[in-house]
């Protein structure tokens, strides 16, 4: 809910900095939650749904309290580069009953790749490294059916959707120790 | 119909600790984060902290910091609270609240827990 | 952390009448489009219940009486026209930054 974000202000203090990190992130998070309602009122969906080649939940891999800067930012990029595959691969491989959700889709993974550049910046600013992903890039097939295509697509959105909630409470929280 | 269900009201004495319940219905327990604010008499509302049931830790404001402990019991849709080293001032209504993720307005609250120090 | 000041601590107005509460924080809580306010009406022995989201967007349920506005460090809830029921108090809370904050309330009693 609420409106678009415009442009954060770039900038050389680290807080503002982490400020237009976080404006981006509760903006993605709305337009992800804003498509996970259309997709349950489109294609409801019957409890939880995972898929292997997503990214653990960075929530289960300690509290919050104990998160550094560094260890947070390099984590929520590499996730959300991975998020941001999935993405790609949904709107490619996604067939006919996705394509009705194309355009919401196509603005998603925009403000993804926004983000992850801002990130990028971030990141480069404070002088941290660049980091690969610490796993191999597990290969997406198609779809095994509509229902597949799906189901992943929930599962895709469910799991953004607690990431960026992960990353906007972590980035805030740590904005108050700078 | 979504509702939270706080358990009822604690009379404790200083140095005690106390654990509140909430237990969630009507919808996806892990939608949201579950939120706790603290009313003392005359006083403002003041923030706790939250948690997000799908795992991970807990945030707190740093007044509640090494006081308040926030849990979950994902199975049973229950959030909790636990206050310890009670004193006087943790006299207040708690209340556990629905908490929209990444934005912190609470649309859903339980009906308040009444926790009463004295000695 | 930010202060959020409410203004007038009480205010009598009569049913029928416009009625404009006022919350002033100690620094902006919006950013490029967005106004982290919210504002909550309480009763005696009742839970807060939320009216207003993100400064200006009516909650689910809540009567087209209510409106918010406002921008950077000042924000109005206003009434236009009160019902018996409105009578109660009013808090605003920011959540801008962590740790949210809430008004000291205002209140809002029958004249």
């Known amino acids: 809910p609420g409106p678009p974000a415009g442009s954060p202000r770039v900038s050389s203090d680290p807080r503002a900095d982490l400020d237009s990190a976080v404006l981006l992130t509760r903006s993605l998070l709305a337009d992800t939650r804003q498509l996970a309602a259309q997709m349950r009122d489109k294609f409801p969906a019957d409890g939880d749904h995972s898929l292997d080649s997503l990214p653990t939940l960075a929530m289960s891999a300690g509290t919050l309290g104990s998160l550094q800067l560094p260890g947070v930012l390099t984590r929520l990029r590499v996730d959300l580069m991975s998020y941001l595959r999935h993405v790609q691969w949904l709107r490619r491989a996604g067939g006919p009953s996705l394509k009705t959700l194309e355009p919401e889709l196509g603005a998603l993974q925009a403000r993804l790749e926004r983000l992850l550049r801002r990130l990028q910046l971030l990141m480069s600013r404070l002088a941290l490294p660049q980091a690969a992903p610490d796993q191999p890039v597990i290969p997406l097939g198609p779809p095994a059916s509509a229902w597949g295509s799906i189901r992943a697509a929930h599962a895709i959105l469910g799991g953004l959707h607690l990431t960026l909630d992960w990353a906007v409470r972590g980035l805030l929280l740590l904005k108050t120790r700078l | 119909e979504v509702q939270l269900v706080q358990s009822g009201a604690e009379v404790k004495k200083p140095g005690a600790s106390v654990k509140i319940s909430c237990k969630a219905s009507?919808?996806?327990?892990?939608?949201?984060?579950m939120d706790w604010v603290k009313q003392a008499p005359g006083q403002r509302l003041e923030w706790i902290g939250d948690?997000?049931?799908?795992?991970?830790?807990?945030i707190y404001n740093q007044k509640f910091t090494g006081r308040a402990t926030l849990t979950v019991d994902k199975s049973a849709s229950t959030a909790y609270m636990e206050l310890s080293s009670l004193r006087s001032e943790d006299t207040a209504v708690y209340y556990c609240?629905?908490?929209?993720?990444?934005?912190?307005?609470?649309?859903?609250w339980g009906q308040g827990t009444t926790v009463t120090v004295s000695s | 952390d930010i202060v959020l000041t409410q203004s007038p601590a009480s205010l009598a107005l009569s049913p029928g009448e416009r009625a404009t509460l006022s919350c002033r924080a100690s620094?902006?809580?919006?950013?490029?489009?967005?106004?982290?306010i919210h504002w909550y009406q309480q009763k005696p022995g009742q839970a807060p219940r939320l009216l207003i989201y993100l400064a200006s967007n009516l909650e689910s349920g809540v009567p087209a009486r209510f409106s918010g506005s406002g921008s950077g460090t000042d924000f109005t809830l206003t009434i236009s026209s009160l019902e018996e029921e409105d009578f109660a108090t009013y808090y605003c809370?920011?959540?801008?930054?962590?740790?949210?904050?809430f008004g000291q309330g205002t209140k809002l009693e029958i004249k």
């Open positions: 009507g919808y996806t327990f892990t939608d949201y984060n």
């Open positions: 609240a629905r908490g929209e993720l990444g934005h912190w307005y609470f649309d859903v």
């Open positions: 809370q920011h959540s801008r930054d962590l740790p949210p904050t």
């Open positions: 948690i997000n049931p799908h795992g991970g830790g807990p």
């Open positions: 620094k902006s809580v919006s950013t490029s489009g967005y106004s982290y």
